[in-house]
Each structure stands twice: as structure tokens, then as C-alpha cells.
Interface confidence: medium
């Protein structure tokens, strides 16, 4: 399985387009990949053709932050994913115990100096193929055919929905590195990003215990996060190997 994925990665490298001619770098990603439910997958991006210094790499799944690799402070894994996400190899990310819900778009966001922000996209499809195959052996042919058809239809729907989402939110950032807006629930993870009205826009300015001074209703939830989030000693981010 892992060798297969490595082959897919080697053969399916895709280059993400850039928003500005000023940015010479390109992000190579594993492109569209698939994996089996319960298995694991490695998400890999590689920044090349630039001498820019990488200061931070974010891994995101649609609107959720999975992990951060910061040049100064190393890796941070979101508590929501800490049981199923492992840092590495390199600046990549390993997803474990995959579920069908993990199907979707993943983004590697490279923050660099002086270029700005580069974003790569990977589409992951988690399949229940082995479960469907083994289950069908014990069913009458008609039920087996129906189940197979259902899987195909579901897969098609997932792909269509994902492609629609992709069109709605193309995640290529400008040189200025403008941050995407996040829902109020995600502001806890990107607290100083541009925020919708009513969210705690100054959250990053307030360590734990200061939410009483903040505007918005998200601060009570934020208060809990300040004490539980921390960077783990998972090894330094070897950014110097990433550009060339």
C-alpha cells in the first residue's frame, strides 16, 4: 500500500499555478490520490524554483487547520486531529486511520520570505473498496450489483461536490499572503485572520485569561484553547531542504 502511494506520488506530481509573476517558485503536490478506509496516507508538497526562505507551513483540510510547522517553534498538531495526524516525513503530513469523511481537499500553505504565500492542493478520496468486495461475496448477485452501483454513485457525488467546492474557493494566495476568512469556529485556530462580524478578531492579542477584555462571543471558547494548545517537540522543521 505504501509503495503504491509512493509510486502515485512519484508519477503524479502536479505543479500549482501562482497568482503573481513576481513569485518564481512552484509547489509540487501529490495531486489527486486515493486510499482505503482504515489505512494511512502521506500528503506531500515540495516548494522549488525559488530561493525564498520558508517561515511556516500550514496544512489545512477545507476550513480546518490540521497542523503547522513553524521555523522557530517546530510542529503543532491541532488537538482535534492529534490522534490521527502525524508530522512528516519532512514537511509532509501523515493521515492515519482514514475514514470516508476524510475525503476532500487538502492544502499545504507555504509562507515564505520574501516571496509571500504559496499554496498547493491535494484531493484525497477515501474508498471502502475492500469492505465492499468482501461483503459482496456473501450476497446474492443482485444485491452485490446494487451495492457496487451505490458506491460508484456516492463516489461520483463526492467528486462533483468536491470539484464544485474547488471552483468556489480556489486557494491560491497573492504575494501579500492575504489570509482566507474562516468561520467563527475556526478563529480559535487562526485568531488574527480577517474575521466575520462578531468574531473575536483580537484573540491573538490575548493570552489566556484576557477574554474579558475582548469583543465578540467566541472568547469564552478561546479561553480554553490557550491553555491546551502548545507546540510539541516533534523535531525541527528542516526548511532549508525544501527550496532549491
Amino acid at each position: 500500500m505504501r509503495w503504491c502511494l509512493l509510486l502515485i506520488w512519484a508519477q503524479g506530481l502536479r505543479q500549482a499555478p501562482l497568482a503573481s509573476g513576481m513569485m518564481t517558485g512552484t509547489i509540487e503536490t501529490t495531486g489527486n490520490i486515493s486510499a482505503e478506509k482504515g489505512g494511512s496516507i502521506i500528503l506531500q508538497c515540495h516548494l522549488s524554483s525559488t530561493t525564498a526562505q520558508v517561515t511556516q507551513v500550514n496544512w489545512e483540510q477545507q476550513d480546518q487547520l490540521l497542523a503547522i510547522c513553524n521555523a522557530d517553534l517546530g510542529w503543532h498538531i491541532s488537538p482535534s486531529f492529534k490522534d490521527r495526524v502525524a508530522p512528516g516525513p519532512g514537511l509532509g503530513l501523515t493521515l492515519q486511520s482514514l475514514t470516508v469523511n476524510d475525503t476532500g481537499e487538502y492544502f499545504c500553505i507555504y509562507h515564505t520570505y520574501p516571496d509571500g504565500t504559496y499554496t498547493g492542493r491535494i484531493f484525497l478520496e477515501v474508498l471502502e473498496s475492500s469492505v465492499a468486495e468482501h461483503g459482496a461475496r456473501f450476497q446474492i448477485p443482485l444485491l452485490g450489483a446494487m451495492a457496487a452501483t451505490l458506491v460508484v454513485i456516492c463516489t461520483a457525488v463526492i467528486v462533483v461536490v468536491a470539484l464544485t467546492r474547488k471552483k468556489k474557493a480556489l486557494r491560491i494566495h497573492s504575494v501579500e499572503g492575504d489570509l482566507r476568512r474562516k468561520s467563527a469556529g475556526q478563529e480559535e485556530w487562526s485568531p488574527s485572520a480577517p474575521s466575520p462580524p462578531g468574531s473575536c478578531v483580537q484573540a491573538e492579542a490575548a493570552p489566556a485569561g484576557l477574554c474579558g477584555e475582548q469583543r465578540g462571543e467566541d472568547c469564552a471558547e478561546l479561553h480554553d484553547y490557550f491553555n491546551v494548545l502548545s507546540y510539541r517537540s516533534l523535531g525541527n522543521c528542516s526548511f532549508f531542504t525544501e527550496t532549491g
Epitope: 517561515t55 517553534l73 485556530w189 488574527s192 490575548a206 489566556a208 485569561g209 490557550f226 491546551v228 502548545s230
Partner: antibody, heavy 126, light 107 residues
Framework: EVQLVESGGGLVQPGGSLRLSCAAS????????MSWVRQAPGKTMEWIGN????????NYAPSLKNRFTISRDNAKNSLYLQMNSLRAEDTATYYC???????????????????WGQGTMVTVSS | DIQMTQSPSSLSASVGDRVTITCRTS??????LRWFQQKPGKAPKLLIH???NLANGVPSRFSGSGSGTDFTLTISSLQPEDFATYYC?????????FGQGTKLEIK
Amino acid sequence: EVQLVESGGGLVQPGGSLRLSCAASGFTFSDHWMSWVRQAPGKTMEWIGNIQYDGSYTNYAPSLKNRFTISRDNAKNSLYLQMNSLRAEDTATYYCTRGHFRITMASMGASASVYWGQGTMVTVSS
Amino acid sequence: DIQMTQSPSSLSASVGDRVTITCRTSQDIGNSLRWFQQKPGKAPKLLIHGATNLANGVPSRFSGSGSGTDFTLTISSLQPEDFATYYCLQHNEYPLTFGQGTKLEIK
């Protein structure tokens, strides 16, 4: 290479004013929180305050809030500390420090201070 | 303000010694603590962040432990370049506050 260079220090009389500057290079200044920290001779460090990456939000040590003002000019990659009504006890080395990246976890603290300038000495004396 | 009590204020040790510096806070700060090293005439250098995490480029002989109100910086085997002053910093609550410092001298 990240560099922070403070300037503007010197001798000033009690009650006077002084404006310190910090020139930043080697990183995207507009992406980082910045802080000022001071250290009186032979004493521990004292956090003065910090400013959000876009300059829209500041925090100060309560004891200094009414006399000190932190500002920044992202176009010039510069951080400033305006000090008014100076007293003898303000005599110290003033450091400019780079805080955390704008979208990094709040748990990293308001002032990561991974990078520091070499400091500029301010002497308040008559 | 959160009060920081750092001890000892000074310490004499020899190369190869194991040294422990403690920092106690007046209230629970979780793991929001950093340790800095400062040499005379120089700016402080970050050693430990998040109470236990080694900053990039810092030798593995340095380690941090503790959470809540009691924290420890340990140098497993002192090297000549480790003789300096060490400070703890809490960043759980404004204003950020530093410990009084521990001056580590050669015995």
C-alpha cells in the same frame, strides 16, 4: 538572516521625551507581532508591550501604559517606542523583539521573542 | 500581575555538573513559560518554549519541565559556554512577566 537594530537611545533629562526606533530586516515585517522589552542595569527584564502585525492593536504593561506608546510603519519595516515624562527609573537597555507569526497559535504567547535586537541604552539623568 | 519567583538567584557550579533552576508562578499558567539565556552585554536567547520544548538550535543538554505553577530548567552537563544568567518568562496573561534571574557562575 533576521536582524533587528534599535536606535534613538541616549541621555535625556527627567521629564523629557525620547523616541526609539527598531529597523527590521530578513523577514516579512508585516507578518509579525513586535514587542519592546527593557532591562535596567543589573536587573531582570521588563516587558513593555507589543503591537499586532498590522498595527491595529497594542498591549502594554499597566505601569507604563500612560507614558509609553508603541507604533509601527510596515512600509518602512520599522517599530517605534515613544517615551514621555521620562524618569530616572526608566534608565535601561531597550530591546526590540520579534513576536510570533500572525497566524500561529495563540498559545505561543503574545511575544515569542525568538529574535532580539542588540539593544539601545537610555539614560535618564539630570 | 503574575509574580515570578526564580531560584536560586545565583549558583556556582563546575563544568560537567548537572544544574537545576526553578521558577514558581503566583498562579496557574499551564505550560505558557519560556526560558532565556543571557550573557553579559548580549541580548537574551530563547532556550525553551511551552515549558518543555527545546528551541531550534539549542543543545539537548538543556531541558525544561513542569506545568501549572512549578517549572524547572535543567542543564544535564555544564559546558563552559553555559555560564550566564537565566530568566523565565510567563506569557499566559498580560502583562508578561520575567523571573528575577539566576546567575550561573564558575566554581
